[in-house]
């Protein structure tokens, strides 16, 4: 089982949308795949895929999950808030027929405030 996650870095404006993609591949077929998205180590959602469908479409605050055969799991955050900033990791495990698990690399999401004044203040707070 292989999991590839992207992008490595994502910078978006508050109120817009962010799309994180996880590509899950296995040489043989699987009957049930457990997937998980975490943010800063905390679980956002942990649905499974079987018969081509996700058991859950919601993933964390303002998060929508979708599965596109053959291998793409997409987490869409819309609208993005400042609280969405963080490190996201996608994990997958084949539960049937045989247990095998893998996880992607981190996607770092940075959310810029919609208000340019807030942005200036933030920069001023962290010089260098």
């Amino acid at each position: 089982l292989s999991v590839q996650q992207g992008p490595n870095l994502l910078q978006v404006r508050q109120g817009s949308q962010a799309t994180l993609v996880c590509q899950v591949d296995q040489a043989t077929a699987w009957e049930r795949l457990r997937v998980k998205w975490t943010k800063d180590g905390a679980i956002l959602c942990q649905p499974y895929i079987t018969n081509g469908s996700l058991s859950l479409g919601v993933c964390g605050p303002q998060g929508r999950l979708s599965w596109q055969a053959p291998s793409h799991l997409t987490l869409q955050l819309d609208p993005v808030s400042l609280n969405h900033s963080g490190a996201y990791v996608c994990w997958a495990a084949v539960e049937i027929p045989e247990l095998e698990e893998a996880e992607g690399n981190i996607t770092r999401l940075f959310v810029d405030p919609d208000d340019p004044t807030q942005n200036r203040n933030r920069i001023a707070s962290f010089p260098g």
Epitope: L1, S2, D25, Q26, A27, T28, A29, W30, E31, L33, I49, T50, N51, G52, A69, P70, S71, P97, E100, A102
Partner: antibody, heavy 120, light 113 residues
Framework: QIQLKESGPTLVKPTQTLTLTCTVS??????????WNWIRQPPGKKLEWMAL???????SYNPSLKSRLTITKDTSKNQVVLTMTNMDPVDTATYYC????????????WGQGTLVTVSS | DIVMTQTPLSLPVTPGEPASISCRSS????????????LNWYLQKPGQSPKLLIY???TRLSGVPDRFSGSGSGTDFTLKISRVEAEDVGDYFC?????????FGDGTRLEIK
Amino acid sequence: QIQLKESGPTLVKPTQTLTLTCTVSGFSITTGGYYWNWIRQPPGKKLEWMALIYTSGRTSYNPSLKSRLTITKDTSKNQVVLTMTNMDPVDTATYYCADMADKGGWFAYWGQGTLVTVSS
Amino acid sequence: DIVMTQTPLSLPVTPGEPASISCRSSQSLFSSNTKRNYLNWYLQKPGQSPKLLIYHASTRLSGVPDRFSGSGSGTDFTLKISRVEAEDVGDYFCQQHYETPLTFGDGTRLEIK
């Protein structure tokens, strides 16, 4: 360019143990998402998948041969090793190693094969 | 185990004529999760290792002549050669990777008349 090369004895006696080595060049067997396989073909017959070892070290065997097989890898030498116990004349075959990726599932690269004859 | 049944076992063809090989599996090789058929076709030329021609039942490997085509889904698959050339002689094998043990068909020997 990835290359696989099988090596081992060309002749073994019945009841003996066969040890075959697959040396991989141009690619590291520690690369994630790859399976390293052994496949054999008796003269004039069909191909038979024998065993695989995954990047993680997980192994899988053909149930018809499982009790006689052990597949391992030596990452320091970039080699995959297959041992087969209690050899019999019906095990006379050309033995191939081949790779397979999670992204695909086909045998992409094959060695040239090594013919092993089992005879007293 | 999934049994792969190939027909015919022998296929004499005149150069320039079409050829067709059938492969049947004892259970479906289609996954509703990935929307893929886990079926590959190989050609083994005399004295050589097998080489991949078609994967996922119908996708031709880059560099394989377009006279080769694969079709089918579920349990019934076909490899077609639109116009056979002398260099196409050899043994053709289908192979499933739906599950382990990975299994091959008995092979079809294509020869030139």
